[in-house]
């Protein structure tokens, strides 16, 4: 008689990443009998919720349910009905909601309340919605990429299964850029982590890790741009802001009330003699870079060395995976190749920013003008943050790998978050067992 395949004994999990600019739903799948093995969980679906981040719904919380419907329906379609009730759903909100909470804890709670009520209406096992800390965001991002790269596996392989594997067990650092915050997380080399707030201790698969992490709130690409505009308008002589971070010929009117809406611009707030100002692009990388550097306070450091704003940063060590907006922006600019040196990236950015706006619009007709107009700033900001903020050099640039997906799963904090909450990363190395008897019939 012929062997019959048993029905797939698999489990599913759902994590919603409620970021500052958008929400994404991720569906993960793994073999039920291999929960504690490293590298068995993989992403089967990403559904990007259509619209802005949840913090934008603060004045219309009753509409959050509609906003989430489409992707939750997608999850209902992808996951077999028999598995719905045992599939956990987690929602983690990041820096956009941290900023809203700084403005009003009550409003942030109201948004999360409605999110919880909406997600509870689905047939899944809803486990809660919460604002995760910047430290968690950094840590879970680090766990995700190292899990996917097979760094926690004790079995050494003579072949490489992933593009960035250096066939050793040294972990990768994680660089995450969002719209409202940015995180840097890595294992320093025999270095004391001088500031306790930045120190994490993990025991994973029988090995101890002393990890450094920091999340810079207000230094995501969108909030950094608001900061830069608020800083520059202080010294503008009238309501025209000639801005080197936008293409020549680009024009946009900004409301002062919008500029000062975010807590990130409070330190630059002043009474201006106008309600609106006009950005006029002049497209100059060097001047843009200089303007961005003024957002990083490097004059004060109470430790042996700092990143910026008095935040401890140990010497960089090993390879780094740069994901989220680090990847999306560099991918758009066609700068993700391992072969592109830092000097070449700078050169390309100079050319890109200098291109006239009309030319850019023609070349990228399919891209929304709001996004398109900000790539010069975002690319320049990434270079400034990595080089001056985190102290990468032209030589260490080659240790940065711009990563979108690893083995088909998105790089980001969501997988690490789910692995942790479902207890799928054991502290000790699981005993290696022969093939499970359920593998064959």
């Amino acid at each position: 008689t012929q062997n019959k395949a048993l029905p797939e004994n698999v489990k599913y999990g759902i994590v919603l990443d409620a970021g500052s600019s958008h929400t994404s739903l991720y569906i993960y799948k793994w073999p039920a009998e291999k929960e504690n093995d490293t590298g068995v969980v993989h992403q089967v679906e990403e559904c990007r919720v259509k619209g802005p981040g949840i913090s934008k719904f603060v004045q219309k919380v009753n509409e959050i349910g509609i906003y989430l419907t489409d992707c939750m329906e997608r999850a209902r379609e992808v996951i077999p009905r028999s598995q719905h009730q045992e599939t956990p759903v987690y929602l983690g909100a990041t820096a956009g909601m941290r900023l809203l909470r700084m403005e009003s804890e009550e409003l942030a709670d109201r948004v999360l309340d409605v999110v919880e009520r909406s997600l509870s209406n689905y047939p899944f096992d809803f486990q809660g919605a919460r604002i995760i800390t910047g430290q968690e965001e950094g840590a879970y991002g680090w766990i995700t990429i190292n899990y996917l790269l097979g760094k926690f596996s004790q079995k050494t392989r003579w072949f490489s299964i992933v593009p960035y594997e250096t066939n050793n067990q040294e972990t990768f650092g994680a660089l995450d850029l969002g719209g409202a915050s940015t995180q840097v997380t890595f294992v320093p080399q025999n270095q004391t982590i001088e500031s306790p707030d930045n120190a994490l201790q993990f025991r994973l698969y029988g090995k101890d890790y002393n990890v450094y992490t920091h999340s810079f709130l207000c230094y995501g690409k969108d909030q950094a741009l608001w900061q830069k505009l608020a800083k520059d308008i202080q010294v503008a002589s009238n309501e025209i802001l000639r801005d080197p971070c936008f293409h020549p010929g680009y024009k946009k009117v900004v409301n002062v009330s919008d500029l000062y809406k975010t807590p990130c611009t409070k330190r630059f707030e002043m009474t201006l003699p106008f309600q609106q100002f006009e950005i006029q692009g002049i497209g100059n990388y060097q001047q843009c870079h200089q303007s961005i550097l003024e957002l990083f306070n490097t004059s004060y450091c109470p430790y042996s060395q700092c990143a910026f704003n008095g935040i401890f940063l140990p010497p960089l060590q090993g390879d780094f995976g740069a994901f989220s907006a680090f990847y999306f922006v560099m991918k758009f600019l066609n700068l993700t190749s391992e072969k592109v040196s830092q000097e070449k990236v700078t050169e390309m950015m100079k050319k890109f920013c200098a291109q006239p706006w009309e030319e850019i619009k023609t070349s990228y007709a399919g891209v929304k003008e709001k996004y398109l107009s900000e790539y010069c700033f975002s690319g320049t900001y990434i270079l400034s943050l990595l080089l001056q903020g985190y102290h990468f050099t032209a030589d260490s640039w080659e240790h940065i790998h711009f990563i979108g997906k690893i083995q088909g799963s998105d790089a980001g904090w969501t997988l690490g978050y789910m692995l942790n909450l479902t207890n799928m990363i054991p502290a000790e190395q699981p005993l290696s067992t022969p093939l499970s008897h359920s593998t064959y019939v």
Partner: antibody
Framework: EVQLLQSGAEVVKPGATVKISCKVS????????LNWVKQPNGKNLEWIGN????????RYNQKFKGRFTITIDQSINTAYMQLNSLRSEDTAVYYC??????????????WGQGTLLTVSS | EIVLTQSPAILSPSPGERVTLTCSAS?????MHWFQQKPGKPPRLWIY???NLASGIPARFSGSGSGTEYTLTISRMESEDFAVYYC?????????FGQGTKLEIK
Amino acid sequence: EVQLLQSGAEVVKPGATVKISCKVSGYSFTDYNLNWVKQPNGKNLEWIGNIDPYSGGTRYNQKFKGRFTITIDQSINTAYMQLNSLRSEDTAVYYCGLYGYDDDANYFDDWGQGTLLTVSS
Amino acid sequence: EIVLTQSPAILSPSPGERVTLTCSASSSVSYMHWFQQKPGKPPRLWIYATSNLASGIPARFSGSGSGTEYTLTISRMESEDFAVYYCQQRSSYPLTFGQGTKLEIK
């Protein structure tokens, strides 16, 4: 502002194939699902299916699965719907449309002007 | 699929009259959307998420309901309101429309 421009009216014979286009502008193409709706001579509206340009994933109403295919060409911001093995009951106005929340969380819903398809021998 | 049944199919109100259109769903939906359509034109979103007026829609229109029963109300009928009104649910796939209520001039 968001605009959806559909291809012109078509008169085709039963059994033939037709491809209707919907060119969108005024927003980032990958930001919203693009839906197709059928309306036979001013009667009921029927949802055919949609495509998510971000992932390329499609969904169909079971009733239209098989002969109807929704695709996109991201490079020219255009969605298509191909109808195969046409029958007289496919005669209708076909609309493309999209809906969702903009960057300021304002809800919007936009439709193309419609493409009249006549299937006749 | 969720079947939406609108009633009445046709209504002939006089200007100034209060008009109520109903939409019943075969199973519970979270929200209902309403569209207005005039001859030769695509449908236009009129009310979204049960009770929110779309941009530019006059305040004499309102929407309410929950679960399986939803209504669109016009407090005082005006001549420009004569059209066909459709309800639509977007809570689950396939998306479905009601068969429409036609408001016609007597």
